[in-house]
């Protein structure tokens, strides 16, 4: 808290300008009007007043708006976002996708570097709470440049909350954007790209489909597999092991074409291994592969989820 | 990535004007704010001002105000700084520098210096 | 103007020492502080920012510590390659102020 003190004679700022960058700490608080500040605040994010300097000016529009600022302000809060608590984020409504941009645009860390965080501060996840609740969907513009500015954003979000995400939003993902996303994210995202997809022929559906898969369900992987899709080995180890583990070796063969050399080296590791033991030997063999560990010859093998499911 | 590569030494009489630039690559030139410094011989860092190259905005240390003029030229990356009535007390080391974040105004990058001496 | 001030203006040691240069404010600063290294005939270098936050790239060697008015900069062991100038500056307002620097030689 700045305590209160009288403007000295001259100072009093008749508008935001760079000679304020000059002022003490107090001298900001006695000789910036809140009015002035809100009014002009298109102006503070081109001066670059220090870090303790934006304590004061945010603490005059703390002062002037109680219960929150107005987007007019918000939109132009600049480097003072950073000041922000989620406390304070809560109390806004941002409906605006501009306003979001600006806000994501000073947060993006000012380092010069390639990495896009992976997922958003607390200030940030909290302003993008309130943006995509306040839509009430996370549509495609939003999803849009969310992921611009963190790749994970997709894959920080529970299964509930992209259950709301639409189909029509699918096309605005990229392979780069599921990368830290779990199984159960992927259960969530698979029907919803299947269906924004379906109307793209073979090859292209693969292509867009194909960093989704971690979702697909066996019959999905089954009819892949006659369609040449030549799925390689990284897409194959992401795929749910409960759904790779019916398939046949004919079928896995024809999933990968000539990836499926890429199976030894991975046989000692889920699904291949868990795969490897549901499959007789000899079929293994015909694969040419040496891959250990399947059936061998003259055990019968009794599906017990089938008996229990007839009894 | 980043480089700020300055002008040559220069040795100028008393009176004299100068105009010193700093090229700058590998990063948006007009995302960040362009500071100038010196260090005479032995002596410290002093801060002199800065320049927005996207605004063409400046602040400036009072003290250097009426003789130095900070300015860019966006369609090079160059900023250029004007020294005019130059005594021998400018004689010094003149280095640019960029500062990422505004708020946080530490110098993140600095050229490699344009000596100059001031003399008779 | 905040000043600045590095009460040594040069340190000896030996090759695995440790050193404290330390520098103060002549106001408070809060954590508002950065340290450079400059080694002979070249540029400034950050080392540490927010008085404790190393740059990335910057031996773990070198720490900084305080707050307010007192702050110190900390080399645990070192070694010959740290011979240079090391400065301080504040960035809590404007103008920006340095210290007048601590030449560091190895014996």
């Known amino acids: 808290e700045v305590e209160k003190t009288a403007c000295p004679s001259g100072k009093k700022a008749r508008e935001i300008d760079e000679s304020l960058i000059f002022y003490k700490k107090w001298e900001l608080e006695a000789c910036v009007d809140a009015a002035l500040l809100a009014t002009q605040m298109d102006r503070v994010n081109a001066i670059p007043f220090t870090y303790e300097q934006l304590d004061v000016l945010k603490h005059k529009l703390d002062e002037l708006y109680p219960q929150g600022y107005p987007e007019s302000v918000i939109q132009h809060l600049g480097y003072l976002f950073l000041k922000m608590s989620p406390e304070d984020i809560r109390k806004w409504n941002v409906t605006s996708l501009e306003t979001l941009k600006a806000l994501l645009e000073v947060n993006k860390g000012h380092e010069m570097s390639p990495q896009a965080p992976r997922r958003p501060l607390p200030q940030v996840a909290t302003l993008i709470d309130r943006f995509v609740k306040g839509r009430g969907q996370l549509d495609k513009d939003t999803l849009d440049t969310l992921t611009a500015f963190y790749p994970g954003y997709l894959c920080s979000l529970s299964p509930e909350e992209l259950s709301s995400v639409p189909p029509s939003s699918i096309w605005a993902v990229r392979p780069q954007d599921l990368d830290t996303c779990d199984p159960r994210q992927l259960d969530v995202l698979y029907p919803k790209a299947r269906l924004a997809f379906q109307n793209m022929n073979g090859s292209e559906y693969f292509v867009k489909i194909q960093s989704f898969l971690g979702g697909a369900p066996t019959e999905d992987l089954k009819a892949l597999s006659q369609q040449n899709v030549s799925m390689d080995l990284a897409t194959f180890m992401k795929l749910r092991t409960d759904a790779v583990l019916p398939l046949t070796v004919a079928e896995v063969q024809k999933l990968l074409g000539p990836h499926v050399e890429g199976l030894k080296a991975e046989e000692r590791h889920r699904p291949v291994r868990d795969w490897i033991l549901r499959q007789r030997q000899d079929d293994l063999d015909t694969l040419g592969l040496g891959l250990q560990g399947g059936i061998p010859n003259g055990y019968l093998v009794l599906d017990l989820s089938m008996q229990e499911a007839l009894s | 990535q980043v480089q700020l590569q300055q002008s040559g030494a220069e040795l100028v009489k008393p009176g004299a004007s100068l105009k010193l630039s700093c090229k700058a690559s590998?990063?948006?030139?007009?995302?960040?704010?362009m500071h100038w410094v010196r260090q005479a011989p032995g002596q410290g860092l002093e801060w002199i001002g800065a320049?927005?190259?996207?605004?063409?905005?400046?602040i400036y240390y009072q003290k250097f105000k009426s003789r130095f003029t900070i300015t860019v030229d966006k369609s090079t990356s160059t900023a250029y700084m004007q020294l005019s009535s130059l005594t021998s007390e400018d004689t010094a080391v003149y280095y640019c520098a960029i500062i990422i974040t505004p708020v946080v105004p530490k110098f993140d990058y600095w050229g490699q210096g344009t000596t100059v001496t001031v003399s008779s | 103007d905040i000043v600045m001030t590095q009460s040594s203006s040069f340190m000896s040691a030996s090759v695995g020492d440790r050193v404290s240069i330390t520098c103060k404010a002549s106001h408070d600063v809060g954590t508002s502080l950065a340290w450079y290294q400059q080694k002979p005939g070249q540029s400034p270098k950050l080392l540490i920012y927010?008085?404790?936050t190393r740059q990335t790239g910057v031996p773990d060697r070198f720490s900084g510590s305080g707050s307010g008015t007192d702050f110190t900069l900390t080399i645990s062991s070192v070694q010959s390659e740290d011979v240079a100038t090391y400065f301080c500056q504040q960035y809590s307002s404007y103008p920006l102020t340095f210290g007048q620097g601590t030449k560091l030689e190895i014996k």
């Open positions: 927010w008085a404790s």
């Open positions: 320049i927005h190259p996207n605004s063409d905005n400046t």
């Open positions: 590998g990063y948006t030139f007009t995302s960040y704010w």
